[in-house]
Interface confidence: medium
């Protein structure tokens, strides 16, 4: 199936040009999306091209600037947030990145009623997190690991917590491992729907071992970065959840929410908090051995000023074949009765589907079913449930948006997006206004991305929000590669792959093959999305065939494929890449003497193991920031899939699955190993140990480090990295420069 046909016609060939590496590094062919910042059922904010903050009313068709670019520029603001009562805007500046989601910033409060910045009781700096209450204009913020509350922006702050301490106690923000591997947010506090209560997490990292690495900077002596970072099997953070009444915060103080007894009996995690009403909250907990999750619904007992979580409102989710959930345990979406909810989990056939839970999980009513998966529940209204899935035409790498009418019986299902722009758009996400009165659809491909606005009742398209016309015009004279998504059936396993082919691809010729791999548990690489990136350039200009393969352990094709890698990381992911390569060779257009593999992070681990598989298939390969031993990676992630590195659990496979154990096998391949020295995520230690093992085995290899760069290798390092990797591959494939 050719998804993005080349626009080459013989008459035009002389005006068409191939992609260049410069195009990719300059971001010449990047696309834009439009996500409305919804502020009501029919209004949204958007930052215009000239940096004004504009309010749009869909029903009146009117728009007006609520905040001028001049005001934004006066404090060098890069972000903003309107208070729900529309009286104030916070302006964010001095953005300073910390980890994947976290950053600190300076915040200024602008009073829209008088057109002035709020003076007096200004916010301290830098702030770790700040947010408005959902109603009115209360402010909660985190400063130096403690939480503060302001009833109004100009009021003095009320300090909620006092025990916050750098790298020790975190209030309202996650520590490193919770941020990266559990919450996937920079915050750990949650307002109740009307702003009566504020819930927050406290993380105690006192006993966690610390990862320390040098940050070279420009000084005479390097700095040492210290991060409490629990590696597999190490001591974990201790978490507690508190709720405070923000109307009278001083009267009673924060109340702790009890942990379910079956969870508290051994090491555990808090996984998410969902407010149901102002006096009902839902907490999700997870055993350290992550196959048991408990959802606990708690009610405020006014008279005792406590949160009560009766056992009858505890719902257990357990996996007998793998870990609980997909990448994370799914979160509930509550219905209007404020007790029943919709949730995605595995059905009896091992496919993730939407279930409706009214009393017990055992009595759950299955809402969707089939040999495909429901992926996200966007919104539940009184009469509709909107969700995404990969059901349509049985392509796991697609995403369409569906509506189920839950207000009528029997419920009927409608695909909202399947036939909108069928060739251009097969991978959607959505953003809904209050009560799903309107919604935006964002299509990511396979054609050029487009964002549109729709009526939530009729699904009619109202207008195009962003169609990337400039990008479309810029690509008119570019020889883009062809892309196809197909599947291989091997030993009862379906291996979906994406192949990127040179513009003048000829099946009778032989081409060098590059495998790009990620392959981590619950990931998906074969997706029907648009991209003009490094591999597009390699196909367009350098004439390579690039393939991406989703093997065992990858997502959205059922639990059999997903959980196949449980407790055995580094085995089947590698096998399936190798199997696919053999099938590609059989297709007849691959030069089997010129096959390479590359990957980043988990992909670096898989590419290293594939190179060291002893098959003789690969001439060369690249590992960027690879994991080299699961004992070096974070507890929350690693133990989810591997269990514990103890003798009575899974230590043997931890030891067997290292890259170092296969050092000898690198002798007959060209290996390029790359890592940032300030990688807080996959520590440089991983590559240092690979290099040491290769040296000890007297195996030649190439390496590049990026000083003071983290797991993303951003900025100028990106250019250097892709230039370096390009030279390496061209040399490996004997392509002239």
């Amino acid at each position: 199936i050719v998804l993005r046909p080349s626009r080459v016609h013989n008459s035009e060939e002389n005006t068409m040009r191939a992609l260049t590496l410069k195009d990719i590094l300059n971001g010449t062919f990047s696309y834009k999306t439009f996500f409305p910042n919804w502020i009501s059922g029919q209004e949204y904010l958007h930052q215009s091209a000239d940096n004004n903050i504009v309010l749009y009313n869909i029903e009146t068709g009117q728009s007006y600037t609520i905040l001028s670019n001049r005001t934004m520029k006066s404090v060098n603001a890069s972000n903003y947030g309107l208070s729900p009562d529309r009286q104030f805007v916070y302006l964010e500046s001095d953005y300073s990145k910390l980890w994947r989601y976290s950053y600190t910033a300076t915040y200024y409060i602008y009073d829209l009623s008088n057109g002035e910045f709020v003076r007096g009781n200004e916010l301290p700096r830098p702030i770790q997190y700040l947010c408005w209450s959902p109603v009115g204009s209360k402010l909660a913020y985190v400063y130096q690991n403690n939480i503060y509350l302001k009833q109004r922006p100009g009021d003095p702050p009320f300090q909620i917590t006092f025990n916050g301490r750098e790298n020790k106690i975190f209030n309202g923000i996650p520590d490193w491992v919770y941020e990266e591997e559990m919450l996937a947010t920079k915050y750990a506090l949650w307002w109740s729907p009307n702003g009566k209560f504020l819930a927050y997490a406290e993380f105690n990292d006192t006993d966690i071992p610390v990862i320390a690495y040098s940050y070279y900077g420009d000084e005479q002596y390097p700095r040492t970065i210290n991060i409490p970072y629990p590696k597999a099997g190490a001591k974990n953070p201790v978490v507690r959840i508190f709720i405070i009444d923000t109307t009278y915060p001083a009267y009673v103080g924060p109340q702790e929410v009890p942990v379910p007894a079956m969870i508290a009996s051994s090491d555990y995690y808090f996984s998410w908090l969902t407010w149901v009403t102002d006096e009902r909250v839902c907490l999700q907990w997870l055993k350290r051995v992550q196959n048991v999750s408990v959802l606990s619904i708690c009610d405020f007992r006014e008279d005792w000023q406590t949160w009560d979580c009766p056992k009858t409102q505890e719902h257990i989710e357990e996996s007998r074949t793998g870990w609980a959930g997909g990448f994370f345990v799914s979160t509930p979406v509550f219905s209007y009765d404020a007790i029943s909810y919709y949730k995605i989990f595995s059905d009896k056939d091992g496919y993730k589907h939407i279930h409706y839970i009214k009393d017990t999980v055992e009595n759950a009513i299955q809402i969707t079913s089939g040999k495909w998966e429901a992926i996200n529940i966007f919104r539940v209204t009184q009469d509709s449930l909107f969700y995404s899935s990969n059901e349509f035409e049985e392509y796991p790498g697609r995403r369409n948006i569906y509506r189920i009418s839950i207000g009528s019986y029997p419920p009927s299902k409608k695909c909202v997006t399947c036939h909108l722009r069928k060739e251009r758009c097969q991978y959607y996400t959505a953003s809904f206004s209050d009560y799903a009165k309107y919604y935006a659809l964002v299509c990511y491909g396979p054609g050029i991305p487009i964002s549109t606005l729709h009526d939530g009742r009729t699904d009619q398209e109202i207008k195009i929000l962003e169609e990337n016309k400039e990008l479309e015009n810029a690509l008119k004279n570019i020889q883009l590669p062809k892309e196809e998504i197909k599947k291989l059936e091997v030993d009862e396993i379906t291996l979906w792959y994406k192949m990127i082919l040179p513009p003048q691809f000829d099946r009778s010729k032989k081409y060098p093959l590059l495998i790009q791999v990620y392959g981590g548990p619950c990931s998906q690489s074969v997706r029907s999305v648009f991209a003009v990136n490094w591999i597009s350039y390699l196909a367009s200009k350098e004439g390579m065939v690039i393939a991406l393969v989703d093997g065992r352990g990858t997502a959205f094709q059922g639990d059999k494929l997903l959980y196949a890698v449980y407790r055995k990381l580094g085995v089947y992911e590698v096998e399936d890449q190798i199997t696919a390569v053999r099938k590609f060779i059989e297709m007849g257009f691959i030069d089997e003497k010129r096959i390479a593999i590359w990957g980043w992070s988990y992909g670096g681990y898989v590419s290293s193991l594939a190179l060291a598989s002893g098959t003789g298939l690969f001439k060369c390969g690249i590992a960027v920031a690879p994991v080299s031993s699961w004992e070096y990676y974070a507890s929350v992630y690693t133990e989810r899939f591997m269990g514990l590195p103890t003798k009575d659990d899974n230590l043997e496979h931890y030891k067997n699955s290292t890259v170092m154990a296969r050092a000898e096998y690198f002798r007959n391949v060209d290996y390029l190993l790359i890592h940032g020295t300030a990688d807080d995520n996959v520590h440089f230690q991983n590559s240092a140990q690979i290099a040491k093992a290769l040296v000890n085995a007297q195996v030649d290899f190439q390496a590049m480090w990026y000083s003071d760069q983290n797991h993303g290798l951003s900025g100028l390092s990106t250019n250097h990295l892709y230039t370096h990797m390009t030279h390496f591959l061209k040399q490996c494939f004997s392509l002239s420069d």
Partner: nanobody, 121 residues
Framework: EVQLVESGGGLVQPGGSLRLSCAAS????????MGWFRQAPGKGRELVAA????????YYPDSVEGRFTISRDNAKRMVYLQMNSLRAEDTAVYYC??????????????WGQGTQVTVSS
Amino acid sequence: EVQLVESGGGLVQPGGSLRLSCAASGRTFSYNPMGWFRQAPGKGRELVAAISRTGGSTYYPDSVEGRFTISRDNAKRMVYLQMNSLRAEDTAVYYCAAGPLWQLYRSHGYWGQGTQVTVSS
């Protein structure tokens, strides 16, 4: 802030009765559940009675159930503990405390200085 002052302790014979009082000052009194705790020499602090904000519900451990009664008067900002059929093992320092029970169990919340109760013949 809540300040608490206990009174009514003393020496009593086994089988006898005592009524402890706790006077509270501070505007947040009525927002807080209240409890009486006790601590015998060489032992940990234990809860003997608790009462909700409005006085609508009470809690007693098995050891004092049926013998002790907790009550409160929000208008007067007072909490009382009526102790009947006293036994030698009830001998302890009795503390009045204000706050949700989980806080009090962790020695958070607001606490009085305590009043001594001795049951002896």
